[in-house]
């Protein structure tokens, strides 16, 4: 009896694992083995596929074959007993195009109100993704074990910290990788769970802000308690993208080590041009807080995000404010080539009650003012990029008196 060729051959590639699956054509015939050949583009001869010769099952692994993953290959299979079936040719394919990204490895560390997630590619030193290692981004789904309400976080890198969690609570998460350059979305990792710790005695510092004054950066933060010492550290932001490396060499800012105030001042030349992460830690001599949330600090934006200058045209019941480009020391305007949003604070000169307007436009009306009253105005600029989230310092306050009634036209 003639042996029939196997049918429905499927090629599954996950990372560097190459798996073939097929269907037997004739279940009634026992003791049949299967063998594959492969052919590279531009070659006439077929080569035996190592790992897939004389296979008794309907699955084989040819991961040991060192292929050029960007080169098209063709496969063929036949059944063998005393005689052999005809060859069945599989559609040619390019391994890289066919490959799926496998589940990443996940390592979790817990604090009281935060979880640190370290993510590594599932296959170390992968051949398939050798040229794409730095292009991996990850997304995760996290939920409280008790509630199951899921939150999705997109576009994270190999180290990510989730804040504002509850102490003594079990959180579960799963992570998948993506190669956006190749339109590839990976497979989720297994679910990993971790319990946050009891609440720490000392909370971390909050609301860290960087501003520029003269040739210095001024770093400010808020803290709950007095009589504390603080230290500040920085890290190159790109290091969070380095796959497989989970040793982060945070560096001290020398002028911000063991400071006793909730701010520190250091020269701009401490940092070369670039994007950095900054974090602050508090200590009372016996206990130490966990590190604050890490803020992103872009020297380019920070250096040029100066307070806006503005002119006021006073009417009886409103001010018209015209915002212009800030001036450098030589009185030349600074060109800001990124979108800004303006925060305008105004108050009656005789009162402390401040009101605030947030506006994208550079001409702003401050309404509902009283005639013949002195109002003061100050403004600052913010970048509209959520991730950078930078703010200038406030401008000096400018005080003007509104006109007498009925001059609003």
């Amino acid at each position: 009896k003639n042996l029939k060729s196997p049918q429905k051959v499927e090629v599954d590639i996950i990372d560097d694992n190459f798996i073939l699956r097929w269907n037997r054509s004739d279940e009634s015939v026992g003791n049949v083995t299967f063998s594959f050949d492969y052919q590279k583009t531009g070659m006439d001869n077929w080569i035996k596929l190592s790992g897939c010769q004389n296979i008794t099952s309907t699955k084989c692994n040819f991961s040991s074959l060192k292929l050029n993953v960007y080169e098209e290959i063709k496969l063929r299979i036949r059944a063998e007993k005393e005689n052999t079936s005809s060859w069945y040719e599989v559609d040619s394919f390019t391994p890289f195009r066919k490959a799926q990204i496998g589940p990443p490895e996940v390592h979790l560390e817990a604090e009281d109100k935060a979880i640190v997630i370290h993510i590594s590619p599932g296959t170390k030193d992968s051949v398939m993704w050798a040229l794409d290692g730095l292009s991996f981004t990850y997304s995760l789904v996290i939920w409280k074990n008790s509630s199951g309400v899921e939150e999705r976080i997109e576009n994270i890198y190999s180290r990510h910290k989730i804040y504002k969690l509850s102490p003594e609570t079990t959180y579960c998460l799963k992570v998948k990788a993506a190669l956006l350059t190749s339109w590839k979305i990976g497979v989720y990792s297994p679910v990993h769970c971790i319990k946050t710790t009891v609440e720490n005695e000392l909370p971390p510092p909050e609301n860290i802000e960087v501003s520029v004054q003269n040739q210095n950066y001024v770093l400010k933060w808020d803290y709950t308690y007095a009589n504390m010492t603080f230290q500040v550290q920085w890290l190159h932001a790109f290091l969070k993208r380095n796959p497989g490396n989970h040793l982060y060499k945070w560096k001290q800012i020398p002028d911000c080590e063991n400071v006793k105030t909730t701010q520190c001042v250091f020269p701009q030349n401490v940092f070369q041009k670039g994007i950095y992460l900054l974090r602050v830690q508090a200590s009372d001599g016996n206990n130490t807080s966990f590190w604050s949330e890490e803020i992103k600090f872009d020297t380019e934006i920070q250096a040029f995000l100066l307070p806006p200058v503005f002119n006021i045209r006073s009417l009886s019941d409103s001010f018209h404010i015209y915002i212009g480009a800030p001036k450098q020391s030589g009185n030349t305007p600074v060109i800001q080539d990124y979108p800004l949003i303006y925060e305008i604070i105004f108050w009656e000169n005789t009162s402390n009650a401040e009101r605030k307007i947030i506006e994208k436009k550079t001409d702003v009306t401050v309404p509902n003012l009283k005639p013949l009253t002195v109002y003061c105005v100050k403004a600052r600029a913010h970048t509209m990029d959520e991730k950078l989230n930078k703010s200038s310092v406030f401008s000096d306050a400018v005080c003007e008196k509104t006109k007498p009634g009925n001059t609003s036209k």
Partner: antibody
Framework: QVQLVQSGAEVVKPGASVKVSCKGS????????MHWVRQAPGQGLEWIGR????????KYAPKFQGRVTMTADTSTSTVYMELSSLRSEDTAVYYC???????????WGQGTLVTVSS | DIQMTQSPSFLSTSVGDRVTVTCKAS??????VVWYQQKPGKSPKVLIY???YRVSGVPSRFSGSGSGTEFTLIISSVQPEDFATYFC?????????FGQGTKLEIK
């Protein structure tokens, strides 16, 4: 494979200094921290400090501050730990260890016995 | 400095027994705890890091748990080669500090 090979045993007089070396192979020392830990006879482990060979930044335990100096020579993949003003209670085995992923001291040298005796 | 208080200091046990070693930190260290095994005349060897992650090649009978201030190392079924001294260490803050050690002896 990763290896840390330390210099040989030393006998030194009280008040003198000792300099112990640790040569790494199978990895680039600039990508890691290098720690020093000591163990007095029959006692526990005590962290002395660490160096980042990439930029020579150091962190010392307050107990050793002012008496210890750590240096690195990246051209020979070697780190050094010098301890001065030695006293008898500094008699111990001194270990170097690599600080790797997740800040874990994952590989250790074989240890160097330093005996302080007059 | 953070104190790491390890107990017991000595533990007499037999092959096949389940053993628990505990470590208490004087302040919250998250999950930044490492467990080492040290045999006489040898350098310490990492068993568990980040409180519960076993180093590859370490037998599955070793497990770690805990967070905050209380940590545990468990050997589910002690083998002859496990008789050694075990140390915990916190890596949350400088200076790194170790527990005083637990010596596991044959009963």
């Amino acid at each position: 494979q990763v290896q840390l090979v330390q210099s040989g045993a030393e006998v030194v007089k009280p008040g003198a200094s000792v300099k112990v070396s640790c040569k790494g192979s199978g990895f680039n020392i600039k990508d890691y921290y290098m720690h020093w830990v000591r163990q007095a006879p029959g006692q526990g482990l005590e962290w002395i400090g660490r160096i980042d060979p990439e930029d020579a930044e150091t962190k010392y335990a307050p107990k050793f501050q002012g008496r210890v100096t750590m240096t690195a020579d990246t051209s020979t993949s070697t780190v050094y730990m010098e301890l001065s003003s030695l006293r008898s209670e500094d008699t111990a085995v001194y270990y170097c260890a690599r600080g790797g992923n997740f800040y874990v001291m994952d590989y250790w040298g074989q240890g160097t016995l330093v005996t302080v005796s007059s | 400095d953070i104190q790491m208080t390890q107990s017991p200091s000595f533990l007499s046990t037999s092959v096949g027994d389940r053993v628990t070693v505990t470590c208490k930190a004087s302040q919250n260290v998250g999950t930044n705890v490492v467990w080492y095994q040290q045999k006489p005349g040898k350098s310490p060897k990492v068993l568990i890091y980040s409180a519960s992650y076993r180093v590859s090649g370490v037998p599955s009978r070793f497990s770690g748990s805990g967070s905050g201030t209380e940590f545990t190392l468990i050997i589910s079924s002690v083998q002859p080669e496990d008789f050694a001294t075990y140390f915990c260490q916190q890596k949350n803050n400088y200076p790194y500090t170790f527990g005083q050690g637990t010596k596991l002896e044959i009963k």
